[in-house]
């Protein structure tokens, strides 16, 4: 028998520095977690103790903090090289800055293979990107070889900016011939490493003949066997065992997100490459694990540029950006409109001639808007200003919801109106009229939404049975502020870009902004 240790991360999302327990900015260092310096300590400890170790990343290193905003992926290549990752799969967020934003900072600089079998380049890009990412890689590990095949969510064109010269194929269809090819190359131990979410990970384990282990990402799935060490609630045991269609037991793993855990899986193979046993658990990277001093020093060196960046002007406002709780928790506020407009703008993807865009709607809890921005400072808007407005380090995500769920969400928005509670929704691509004289749960008297399947966008009444795409904060997608109906009834959820980054990109693009209060939210009675 031959034993392999798989160390894995996924959805790190730019958390190079240690973070608080909820993966936001580290405040009290003695209680902080994760970060590449701490990760390196643990990885090195395991490499020294065990003979056959692979360090793998299942995608979405890009996007999530000011580190990515400033360094644009160069930080990912640098620190992943320093940690000596063995392979990485492409995630959807690796395309956030377009193909060039992937090629130059990461693909050309990484000293480890970057993989995806279901992304096919065409046209002029084919020769430019040739060899920079691979469908698979055969890695020598001790006296053996291990094949790693990569995959990426085929929804990437709707979630990011891969352009028109990359085709995202069905994962299973693309993986099978690569696995078959590996078998002709004498490779009898094969890991599928990819970024399509836990449901697809399980399908790959079930359907792709010859895959021995699946290491996934995208859905931020936390798996654990035994008592979990922090706040995350396990979605199942680690590893999650899938019985394949040809009768094999295939371990499937994922390691939550944000570099909070290091996935740790031990696999025992027989001489024919069959999995005999698999066990392990994610390792919580808490403060009991010291940060590696040399990596930490490097982080501090790279940090300097971030501090300079946060005070630089992104653009100007010529109007007061009203982000006060007195406005945003009670009525339409122009800060809410600005943020929603930025959220939609960030999701412009012309992937179908029938649609002017795949999504037109935004909702945003007023309680998530934490500060106004005064225009009387020469109109200057900085990252620092935006960090005061959006201090929680969240993301603006894409969900699919039925009209009936949206209606419930808008009822919830005003079910206890007047108490300055955070659930009051700011909107984009939506016209809502409330009648507060009616009883809670029946206050939405008009709800019109902007069409997507149209050449001239116009507002149509919401249809209860229709499925709509909506951009919203991850906080809402996860049921925050009492929006349990969103969490319970959403049909699809894909995590998006860092909230501040979305707004800062929009302001930089527009240069000068002047958002108005324009009648997106109306009240049919009372003095509003």
């Amino acid at each position: 028998a031959w034993e392999l240790t798989i160390l894995h991360t996924n959805d790190v999302h730019s958390r190079l520095e240690q973070t608080s327990e909820d993966s936001s900015k580290c405040v009290n260092a003695s209680r902080c977690m994760g970060g590449v310096a701490r990760l390196f300590t643990k990885v090195q400890q395991i490499r020294r103790a065990e003979p056959n170790v692979l360090l793998l990343d299942a995608g979405d290193q890009y996007q999530g903090t000011i580190w990515f905003t400033v360094y644009k992926g160069a930080e990912v290549a640098h620190f992943m090289n320093a940690l000596r990752y063995d392979a990485m799969a492409l995630g959807n967020h690796e395309f956030d800055n377009g193909v060039e934003g992937l090629i130059e900072p990461l693909l050309k600089e990484a000293k480890f293979p970057i993989l995806s079998a279901n992304i096919k380049a065409k046209g002029p890009l084919a020769s430019q990107i040739s060899g920079l990412y691979l469908p698979y890689k055969v890695l020598p590990v001790g006296d053996e070889v291990v094949g790693i095949v990569g995959y990426t969510s085929k929804e990437t064109p709707f979630l990011s900016n891969p352009g028109t010269n990359l085709v995202f194929e069905d994962e299973i269809t693309a993986l099978q011939p690569e696995v078959d090819k590996l078998k002709t190359l004498n490779v009898n131990k094969i890991i599928a490493l990819g970024h399509s979410g836990f449901e697809m990970d399980k399908l790959i384990a079930q359907k792709v003949r010859g895959v021995d282990v699946v290491v996934g990402g995208h859905s931020n799935t936390f798996l654990y066997t035994g008592n979990p060490p922090s706040k995350e609630v396990p979605a199942g045991k680690y590893p999650f065992i899938v019985t394949s269609d040809d009768g094999r037991k295939v371990p499937v793993v994922q390691a939550y997100a944000f570099g909070k855990y290091l996935g740790y899986l031990k696999i025992e193979f027989d001489e024919r490459g069959n999995v005999i046993s698999s066990h392990g658990n994610p390792i919580l990277l808490n403060s009991s694990i010291p940060e590696d001093p040399s990596i930490k020093a490097d982080i501090n060196k790279w940090r300097i540029k971030l501090d300079n960046y946060s005070t630089q002007e992104l653009g100007k406002t010529i109007v007061y950006l009203d982000g006060s709780s007195q406005s945003c928790r009670f009525r339409e506020c122009n800060m809410g409109n600005l943020i929603c407009d930025a959220m939609i703008n960030n999701n412009l993807r012309h992937t179908d001639e029938m649609f002017w865009n795949h999504v037109s709607m935004c909702i945003l809890n007023g309680g998530g808007i934490r500060s106004p921005i005064d225009e009387r400072n020469n109109g200057t808007i900085t990252w620092e200003n935006l960090a005061a407005v959006l201090p929680f380090g969240g993301t603006f995500d894409l969900v699919q919801l039925k009209g009936s769920t949206l209606k419930k969400a808008f009822e919830h928005s005003v079910h206890r109106y007047g108490q300055s509670t955070g659930e009051f929704l700011q909107v984009g691509g939506i016209h809502v009229v409330y009648d507060l004289s009616r009883k809670p749960g029946d206050r939405v008297v008009k709800l019109d939404v902007l069409c997507t399947k149209c050449r001239v966008p116009s507002y149509d009444p919401l249809k209860m049975d229709e499925v709509y795409k909506v951009i919203l904060p991850n906080f809402l997608a996860n049921g925050g502020d009492g929006f349990q109906m969103i969490k319970d009834e959403l049909l699809r959820h894909d995590s998006g870009d860092q909230d501040i980054n979305v707004v800062s990109t929009y302001i930089s693009k527009m240069k000068v902004i002047y958002p108005a209060v324009e009648g997106r939210i109306k009240f049919s009675t009372g003095s509003h």
Epitope: A126, S127, S130, P135, V138, P140, V145, G147, P177, D180, K181, K183, T184, L185, N186, V187, N188, R209, G210, R272
Partner: antibody, heavy 120, light 110 residues
Framework: EVQLVQSGGGVVQPGRSLRLSCAAS????????MHWVRQAPGKGLEWVAV????????YYADSVKGRFAISRDNAKNTLYLQMNSLRREDTAMYYC?????????????WGRGTLVTVSS | QSVLTQPPSASGAPGQRVTISCSGS????????VNWYQRLPGAAPQLLIY???QRPSGIPDRFSGSKSGTSGSLVISGLQSEDEADYYC???????????FGTGTKVTVL
Amino acid sequence: EVQLVQSGGGVVQPGRSLRLSCAASGFTFSSYGMHWVRQAPGKGLEWVAVISYDGSIKYYADSVKGRFAISRDNAKNTLYLQMNSLRREDTAMYYCASGLTGVAGALGVWGRGTLVTVSS
Amino acid sequence: QSVLTQPPSASGAPGQRVTISCSGSSSNIGSNTVNWYQRLPGAAPQLLIYNNDQRPSGIPDRFSGSKSGTSGSLVISGLQSEDEADYYCAAWDDSLSGNVFGTGTKVTVL
């Protein structure tokens, strides 16, 4: 010593069948993908077929698809090529070869070849 | 019929440098590695270069390989009389799901 010893070649009439064998020694046969390659008189090398280490995956050149079948017996350390419906253009020196681990298209060890002549 | 194109012949005096090209497409050399074989008269082919530029043990360092885009090349830097042979490039072709060989190049030592 790593060796591939071939047998089974000869003269055969068009439309008939022939089975080539390739006996392996000196290495763990069951760990290697195996290939057949041929060279017609005065022509270049032409790849014929490959079989994975466990026999589960087989690929063929278009020119032999549906007529030739590659197989292996790991217990006997032997590779086979069953050639049916032979044509004159199948006349060639046939080589068996082992694939290099992890490198597509790289054949590390070759047999000395066996001649197949298809003639009436 | 070969999918990879090589010049039919190449020659040089002893000690000279000879380069053989191998042209393919995105489905073979473009997405896979190039391998080179030497076939001496009356002998079975032997692997000369694998993985674009790697030499198996026992292959002299005067043989070197490289790949760029959808082409590969083999360089014999100090030609010797025993290098007179046929040389073939090869690669896996993803659209054919099989190996493809080059047309072959006959190297003559003058």
